[in-house]
């Protein structure tokens, strides 16, 4: 067990151009007050999973009022430590998160309000029992200067806190097997204390207050001998490469406790124990009041109507959640059209549209074709965000600015050599052929196949294509 | 071995307060965690609410709204009291002795009727 | 809130028959499960709590096993008086019972 240590050295703007405005005002005077969040290991660091490892509020800060026309200076801080209790073993690797609130102290209807001034967060390794870590966070142009350290209670000592440490028994040495406690040399490591009732024989601890159990033993003190009659193998209890021996459920399994209530069995149930800020048999129901800013980023607090809801936040866009912890994955719900990308910024979404999209959410289909000239009588043609030109006959390209070669496919059959004129192409049929393409052979009594050619025009003439 | 003994309810009529009290004999009300329990003809049993020796309460989150649930060591009996019924909360209400979440003894049962 | 299914609804059983009913939980509720057996008019009776445990009183005949999301009850022989309806309760979270298995003579 210990606790850990958050010193608060300054709140204010940061270093860099545009200098936040003061919180607080002649006509809005305020206070600040400070939140921290603790969660074990290096987790992420939204506010989505409890504080695991602890919370704790500062006290007020002294009233402020702003000076007109001065820049936001370094606010009034709360006096005082916050201090977050940890029963269990210090993790050393740690994610933290710590909020800025302030506390309006105008004539506001129903009392004080609250709102979030800055957020930060960060994931750090700390050894207990170490120096105090100095730490600078900036949020916006808040910046926020700060130490903390982790401090193991008497009688536990070592990085985690895990290891206990006694008074010498002897002046001159520790008992058998033990250590003597650094860096207080004047006192010998004690044996771990495992949970009362642990069995000697069939149990062991690594913590203090733990029972855990040898192979082949099962219940909460070891004192069980698994049943092994389900065994798939003919292996017995004593082989260490068994996989049929399973634990027997320890105490209140799968803590039914809410909240973090600690849980002891009944003869048919059980009973929770309650953290403070919270109540009820399983500890579902918060104690907290609006007095204790219990809602995140930025929620507005108002006190619940009824006696088991002490207060309800309303969440600013963006945030869900009984304390508005939880960020919406506001990108979810898909608000982007037309196929453009989704960006959640925290404080708005945008829209990155694709190429003929415009609009907040790319909801505007752009005129492809507006100031678009297709040249050489083209016609534009919109589609997907982008604009094609359909070409009048003998010219292509982009914009219908090149003029096509009609002889380039080679279109004239049968050896015939083709022309290129101003409204298109021209077959000059090679003997025995005719048709626009010189596609039909002529019979060989002068006779065609084709109906009579047009007046004008003799088999074997150059047939234009039209 | 404790007995429980329970009256009160009948006929109401919608919008009225359901109001039941369960006497404890042949033991304490202190120690332990009294139960309301309801079943509609011919349904399943739904549990109301609870109550310990401290007057902590737990209750269904889908009736807490109308359901009060108090204690009396002193009279070794506990009451409920539901606010606002309609015929959806006819049915036969136990109370019952045990612990968390659990009932070990139960009373008779009463038949609660709602009808206009 | 937690679901609680019973299957099957309704058992079609023999004297000295083995009977075995089944209880599923929406989530896990670890081993806080109960079993009742209910007679027509009357209060139902605590049978198993903790999954497995046996109430004072009741007969080694009954048996509970599971853990998590999948409980059963185990009737060994089934005895005259033990045409009843049967319900599991999960008492992890507030509490909630299954909507109950009436065993009825063959």
């Known amino acids: 067990a210990g606790v850990f240590e958050l010193q608060i050295h300054s709140f204010g703007p940061g270093p860099g151009p545009g200098a936040p405005r003061s919180p607080c005002s002649a006509r809005l005077p305020c206070r600040l007050f400070f939140r921290v969040c603790l969660k074990p290991g290096l987790s992420e660091e939204a506010a989505e999973s409890p504080c695991a490892l602890g919370a704790a509020l500062s006290a007020r800060g002294p009233v402020y009022t702003e000076q007109p026309g001065a820049p936001a200076p370094d606010l009034p801080l709360p006096d005082g430590l916050l201090q977050v209790p940890f029963r269990d073993a210090w993790p050393g690797t740690f994610s933290f998160i710590i909020e800025t609130w302030r506390e309006e102290l105008g004539d506001q209807i129903g009392g004080p309000a609250w709102s979030l001034l800055a957020r930060v967060a960060g994931r750090r390794r700390l050894a207990a029992g170490g120096p105090w870590a100095r730490d600078i966070q900036r949020a916006g142009a808040w910046e926020l200067r700060f130490s903390y350290r982790a401090r193991c209670e008497p009688p536990a000592v070592g990085t985690a806190c895990t290891r206990l440490c006694r008074p010498r028994s002897a002046p001159s040495r520790c008992g058998p097997g033990l250590r003597p406690c650094a860096p207080l040399e004047d006192e010998c490591e004690a044996p771990l204390v495992c949970r009362a009732g642990c069995s000697p024989e069939h149990g062991f601890c690594e913590q203090p207050g733990e029972c855990r159990c040898l192979e082949g033993w099962t219940g909460p003190l070891c004192t069980v001998p698994v049943s092994t009659s389900s065994c798939l193998s003919p292996r017995g209890p004593s082989s260490a490469t068994t996989g049929c021996l399973v634990p027997g459920p320890g105490p209140c399994d799968g803590n039914p406790c809410a909240n973090g209530g600690s849980c002891s069995e009944t003869p048919r149930s059980f009973e929770c124990t309650c953290p403070r800020g919270f109540y009820g048999l399983r500890c579902e129901v918060s104690g907290v009041t609006c007095a204790d800013g219990p809602c995140f980023n930025g929620g507005l607090c108002v006190g619940g109507a009824d006696p088991d809801s002490a207060y309800i936040c309303h969440c600013p866009p963006g945030f869900q959640g009984s304390n508005c912890e939880k960020r919406v994955d506001r990108c979810s719900l898909q608000p982007c059209r037309n196929g453009g990308l989704c960006l959640d910024l925290g404080h708005a979404l945008r829209c990155r549209c694709r190429a003929g999209f415009a609009g907040p959410r790319c909801e505007h289909d752009l005129d492809d074709c507006a100031g678009r000239a297709c040249a050489n009588g083209g016609t534009c043609v919109e589609g997907g965000g982008a604009h094609r030109c359909s070409c009048a006959l003998g010219f292509g390209g982009r914009d219908c600015r090149e003029r096509a070669d009609p002889c380039a496919a080679r279109p004239c059959a049968h050896g015939g050599r083709c022309y290129a004129h101003f409204s298109g192409l021209v077959c000059a049929c090679a003997p025995g052929y005719m048709g626009a393409r010189c596609e039909f052979p002529v019979h060989p009594d002068g006779a065609s196949a084709l109906p009579a050619a047009p007046p004008g025009l003799r088999p074997g003439d150059p047939q234009r294509y039209l | 071995q404790v007995q429980l003994q329970q009256w009160g309810g009948g006929l109401l009529k919608p919008s009225e307060t359901l109001s039941l009290t369960c006497a404890v004999y042949?033991?304490?009300?202190?120690?332990?965690?009294w139960s309301w329990i309801r079943q509609p003809p011919g349904k399943r049993l739904e549990w109301i609410g609870e109550?310990?020796?401290?007057?902590?309460?737990s209750y269904n989150p889908s009736l807490k709204s109308r359901v009060t649930i108090s204690v009396d060591t002193s009279k070794n009996q506990f009451s409920l009291k539901l606010s606002s019924v309609t015929a959806a909360d006819t049915a036969v209400y136990y109370c019952?002795?045990?612990?968390?979440?659990?009932?070990?003894?139960w009373g008779q049962g009463t038949l609660v009727t709602v009808s206009s | 809130d937690i679901q609680m299914t019973q299957s099957p609804s309704t058992l079609s059983a023999s004297v000295g028959d083995r009977v075995t009913i089944t209880c599923r939980a929406s989530?896990?509720?670890?081993?806080?499960l109960a079993w009742y057996q209910q007679k027509p008019g009357k209060a139902p009776k605590l049978l198993i709590y903790?999954?497995?445990s046996l109430e004072s009183g009741v007969p080694s005949r009954f048996s509970g096993s599971g853990s998590g999301t999948e409980f059963t009850l185990t009737i060994s022989s089934l005895q005259p008086d033990d045409f009843a309806t049967y319900y599991c309760?999960?008492?992890?979270?507030?509490?909630?019972f299954g909507q109950g298995t009436k065993v009825e003579i063959k």
């Open positions: 019952a002795r045990g612990e968390l979440g659990i009932a070990d003894s």
């Open positions: 042949g033991g304490s009300s202190s120690g332990n965690y």
């Open positions: 109550i310990n020796h401290s007057g902590t309460t």
């Open positions: 989530q896990s509720i670890s081993r806080w």
């Open positions: 903790k999954a497995s």
């Open positions: 309760q999960q008492y992890n979270s507030y509490s909630t």
